[in-house]
């Protein structure tokens, strides 16, 4: 007779990433007896919630429950019923909600309150919904990619310390691009972090890490576009904005009220003699790049070195994983290969932006026009941000790795967040005995 397989002794966790443009739910799974080992937690499912980000529900909070239903029901189906009550659920909201809170703390609280009530109705162990800080977002993204890459996995054997990765223990830096903010996080080489706000100290698996992180609010790709439009319309002679960041032949009407809705455009706000204006694409990479650079104030730096807007940035060090919108945009543009040089990326962006809108629509018939129309801007913005904002060079460009998933888990802050909240990253190195090591998978 065949041996019956023992029931899997696994645990689950759920994290909802409430971003500025949409919400995603991630289910994580790990063997119960190995929760303090590195690299054992993996993403078993993901669900993208239909609709916009939660901050857009400010005038219709009663719809939040329905909005979350499909993905929460999918989670209920995906996790065995016997595990429901001990499965923690966390919701972390990022820059979209940070911006809403800047406008009105009361409105942000109301949205979160309804989210919490909705999530409490499910049979899981709901642990709360909160707006995470930009610093947390950067730090948890850094933890996620390094955890998945096995960078923390210097296993202590019962008889000696044998690194699994002999020459490759340097951590990766993390570059995260969202709709409303962007984060840069890495371990600088023998460099004092001059600004205390940007310094983090971690002790993970027995090793100390001095980490630099900064989150640039309003510099996610969507808010950067709003900033650029608000800046450029200031000097437009009429209600037509000839825009180099959109394809030739592209036309779109923008309401001035929408433009000034976000706190990110406040610095460019002025009384305009029209209620709406029309974007007319002219598709010129170089001019688009120049326009984007005007969003980065590099004239002032109170430190030895800055990124932009007076924010300290140490010299870049080592390899970087660029994920979220960095990856999605570059993947669409077919520019994620490590060997595509920065010069080649620039060249390809010039050609892409110059393509007529009608041609682009035909070539990418399956892509929603709203997204399709913005790839020229987004690609140019990514190049501008990395090269002029963060000071990557043609040489260091080759150390940027555009990453979607690692070992089947999305690169992003959610896994790191859950690992931290479930205390699954020990400060000290867990000692493995001969028996537990022999059963290692």
């Amino acid at each position: 007779t065949q041996n019956k397989a023992l029931p899997e002794n696994v645990k689950y966790g759920i994290v909802l990433d409430a971003g500025s443009s949409h919400t995603s739910l991630y289910i994580y799974k790990w063997p119960a007896e190995k929760e303090n080992d590195t690299g054992v937690v993996h993403q078993s499912a993901e669900c993208r919630v239909k609709g916009p980000g939660i901050s857009k529900f400010v005038q219709k909070v009663n719809e939040i429950g329905i909005y979350l239903t499909d993905c929460m029901e999918a989670a209920r189906e995906a996790i065995p019923r016997s595990q429901h009550q001990e499965t923690p659920v966390y919701l972390g909201a990022t820059a979209g909600m940070r911006l809403l809170r800047m406008e009105s703390e009361e409105l942000a609280d109301r949205v979160l309150d309804v989210v919490e009530r909705s999530l409490s109705n499910y049979p899981f162990d709901f642990q709360g919904a909160r707006i995470i800080t930009g610093q947390e977002e950067g730090a948890y993204g850094w933890i996620t990619i390094n955890y998945l890459l096995g960078k923390f996995s210097q296993k202590t054997r019962w008889f000696s310390i044998v690194p699994y990765e002999t020459n490759n223990q340097e951590t990766f830096g993390a570059l995260d691009l969202g709709g409303a903010s962007t984060q840069v996080t890495f371990v600088p080489q023998n460099q004092t972090i001059e600004s205390p706000d940007n310094a983090l100290q971690f002790r993970l698996y027995g090793k100390d890490y001095n980490v630099y992180t900064h989150s640039f609010l309003c510099y996610g790709k969507d808010q950067a576009l709003w900033q650029k439009l608000a800046k450029d319309i200031q000097v437009a002679s009429n209600e037509i904005l000839r825009d180099p960041c959109f394809h030739p032949g592209y036309k779109k009407v923008v309401n001035v009220s929408d433009l000034y809705k976000t706190p990110c455009t406040k610095r460019f706000e002025m009384t305009l003699p029209f209620q709406q204006f029309e974007i007319q694409g002219i598709g010129n990479y170089q001019q688009c790049h120049q326009s984007i650079l005007e969003l980065f104030n590099t004239s002032y730096c109170p430190y030895s070195q800055c990124a932009f807007n007076g924010i300290f940035l140490p010299p870049l060090q080592g390899d970087f994983g660029a994920f979220s919108a960095f990856y999605f945009v570059m993947k669409f543009l077919n520019l994620t290969s490590e060997k595509v040089s920065q010069e080649k990326v620039t060249e390809m962006m010039k050609k892409f932006c110059a393509q007529p809108w009608e041609e682009i629509k035909t070539s990418y018939a399956g892509v929603k026009e709203k997204y399709l129309s913005e790839y020229c801007f987004s690609g140019t913005y990514i190049l501008s941000l990395l090269l002029q904002g963060y000071h990557f060079t043609a040489d260091s460009w080759e150390h940027i790795h555009f990453i979607g998933k690692i070992q089947g888990s999305d690169a992003g802050w959610t896994l790191g967040y859950m690992l931290n909240l479930t205390n699954m990253i020990p400060a000290e190195q867990p000692l493995s005995t001969p028996l537990s090591h022999s059963t290692y998978v």
Epitope: N167, E398, K405, I406
Partner: antibody, heavy 118, light 108 residues
Framework: PVQLQQPGAEVVMPGASVKLSCKAS????????MNWMRQRPGQGLEWIGE????????NSNQRFKGKATLTVDKSSSTAYMQLSSLTSEDSAVYFC???????????WGTGTSVTVSS | EIVLTQSPTTMTSSPGEKITFTCSAS???????LHWYQQKPGFSPKLLIY???NLASGVPTRFSGSGSGTSYSLTIGTMEAEDVATYYC?????????FGGGTKLEIK
């Protein structure tokens, strides 16, 4: 266990087409790229192309453009490669393999032996 | 495309010996993109080492990898009879992904 199952063999006529399958199990199919490789008798490995099952995005080796078409069926967690206008040169073992960051192939199918013969 | 050259094409060794396979790339590769596989006759290839130096799951610790730039190597600390196979390096750094021609390890 994570597995990629492929049919053992296919015999096809010259000029015809064949659609090879690769059924994934034991993991979330849409979370990893699927790659295809060719190995001619007594030869080394050649990469044909890759597909991301989450959005059907593909990259392929120029050498196989017009020869190989990659598709997936998410509902059955199966990847397919259609080979067209077959000649004796296409007689080989074709492997599917799961890809991860760094573009290494951590799980391989058992391989399908394709023989082009009249 | 990046061409990977493996040498030697064939090597003969005795159990207990230390063996090193080399893989030379036609242009520099970031170490995160160089991997090694073992293929036994009639079987599918099996991942041994990924990202230059990381041991794949279930692979004996006698296997190790190192290298950077254009020069990479795979070492078997103490050869065993079951290691008779062909060993391939592979790069994922650029499209198309490419494999080395392989080194066939035979037993003395």
């Amino acid at each position: 266990p994570v597995q990629l199952q492929q049919p053992g063999a296919e015999v096809v006529m010259p000029g015809a087409s064949v659609k090879l399958s690769c059924k994934a199990s034991g993991y979330t199919f849409t979370s990893f790229w699927m790659n295809w490789m060719r190995q001619r008798p007594g030869q080394g490995l050649e990469w044909i192309g890759e597909i991301d099952p989450s959005d059907f995005y593909t990259n392929s080796n120029q050498r196989f453009k017009g020869k190989a078409t990659l598709t997936v069926d998410k509902s059955s967690s199966t990847a397919y490669m259609q080979l067209s206008s077959l000649t004796s040169e296409d007689s080989a073992v074709y492997f599917c393999a799961r890809g991860d960051f760094g573009w290494y192939f951590d799980v391989w199918g058992t391989g399908t032996s394709v023989t082009v013969s009249s | 495309e990046i061409v990977l050259t493996q040498s030697p094409t064939t090597m003969t060794s005795s159990p207990g010996e230390k063996i090193t396979f080399t893989c030379s790339a036609s242009s520099s590769i970031n170490s995160n993109y160089l991997h090694w596989y073992q293929q036994k006759p009639g079987f599918s290839p099996k991942l041994l080492i990924y990202r230059t130096s990381n041991l794949a799951s279930g692979v004996p610790t006698r296997f190790s990898g190192s290298g950077s730039g254009t020069s990479y190597s795979l070492t078997i600390g103490t050869m065993e009879a079951e290691d008779v196979a062909t060993y391939y390096c592979q790069q994922g750094s650029s499209l198309p992904r490419t494999f080395g021609g392989g080194t066939k390890l035979e037993i003395k």
